[in-house]
């Protein structure tokens, strides 16, 4: 069964997925897709990495952690009710049928009506539209658009909270952290 994660409309959703690479430059390809993991690959791919690079991502999906160390946790920016459902994190270990597949269920809750937004959690305004790239080279040698402006203090605070959260620990405990090499 899928591990369940929750996010509110307008917030950023966090879907953890981890592995341990043999070395920071010798990575395992990973794909994220909308929908349960199929037999091969990912369906409806929203983000993909290869042995070295993040070579495909779209405007609302990006990696929060250091993917060179195997933190391929997905952030979905500014979620809507349409974002609910199953997401597949597939760690594409070389060899026949060696892939590690994790299905994560995202449940979207309606936004709470509050007198004022909580600043620490509500930082989606800090993100302009992210470019879509398919491995076009160094970031500012591209002409596809701007990369996301991220408030690092807020991100770091959120990352620390998530790192300590029971959900992240539950995922690790359920086997979503694997060692490669």
């Amino acid at each position: 069964s899928e591990v369940e994660y929750r996010a509110e409309v307008g917030q950023n959703a966090y879907l953890p997925c981890f592995y341990t690479p043999a070395a920071p430059g010798n990575l395992v390809p990973v794909c994220w897709g909308k929908g349960a993991c199929p037999v091969f690959e990912c369906g409806n791919v929203v983000l993909r990495t290869d042995e070295r690079d993040v070579n495909y991502w779209t405007s609302r999906y990006w990696l929060n952690g250091d993917f060179r160390k195997g933190d391929v946790s997905l952030i979905i920016k500014n979620v809507t009710l349409d974002d609910h459902g199953i997401y597949c994190c597939r760690i594409q270990i070389p060899g026949i049928m060696n892939d590690e597949k994790f299905n994560l269920k995202l449940v979207i809750k309606p936004a709470k009506v509050t007198p004022a937004p909580t600043r620490q959690r509500d930082f989606t305004a800090a993100f302009p539209r992210m470019l879509t790239t398919r491995g076009h080279g160094p970031a500012e040698t591209q002409t596809l658009g701007s990369l996301p402006d991220i408030n690092l203090t807020q991100i770091s605070t959120l990352a620390n909270e998530l790192r300590d959260s029971r959900l992240a620990n539950d995922l690790r405990d359920s086997g979503a952290t694997i060692r490669i090499g």
């Epitope: 990006w62 990696l63 160094p138 500012e140 991220i150």
Partner: antibody
Framework: QVQLQESGPGLVKPSETLSLTCTVS??????????WNWIRQPPGKGLEWIGY???????NYNPSLKSRVTISLDTSKNQFSLKLSSVTAADTAVYYC?????????????WGQGTLVTVSS | EIVLTQSPATLSLSPGERATLSCRAS??????LAWYQQKPGQAPRLLIY???NRATGIPARFSGSGSGTDFTLTISSLEPEDFAVYYC?????????FGQGTKLEIK
Amino acid sequence: QVQLQESGPGLVKPSETLSLTCTVSGGSFSRGGYYWNWIRQPPGKGLEWIGYIYYSGSTNYNPSLKSRVTISLDTSKNQFSLKLSSVTAADTAVYYCARDHYSSSWTFDYWGQGTLVTVSS
Amino acid sequence: EIVLTQSPATLSLSPGERATLSCRASQSVSSYLAWYQQKPGQAPRLLIYDASNRATGIPARFSGSGSGTDFTLTISSLEPEDFAVYYCQQRSNWPPTFGQGTKLEIK
């Protein structure tokens, strides 16, 4: 346009700790996907990658220097820093800070001007 | 780690001539090779990434080729500002490594 600028003492005594700071201006320090690196170049020699820090604070170091290197981040000042302990004359070099992005890992598209650090008593 | 060997160590040419610089890897780096230009007192500048792709703002006279273990940086017609030291760098295997450089000097 992003700019990187190194600063720190130009002279360090043997066995002491070398400390340098890189200040990033032009906006990209607050963008996800960027890695902030230190690279050095001994006089008349080639370049050597020292290590990186990611915005989350995650670090990674060259195995040849790992036991002596610490890279840290100060997001409030748009700075990241290098500390290299127990230095010897072999650590005399021009030290550069540089940036790469996860869409083209380890391809360093922006560099600081470099700062010469001499290890001598 | 992968060792990159650049040749020649020094290349003496005149403006307008064609320059060919070589970089050889101790093992295959596929196409994961970059070239940088460094002038005295300045930081390295990215010219070519992934063997053959010019970085932003790099003139068309600079081109890169090769794959596997043998790579070439070609400057089709040398301009006075091209005389500098050129480094290759691989990103195929960790840690990333650089060559020792080729000095391109005016004859």
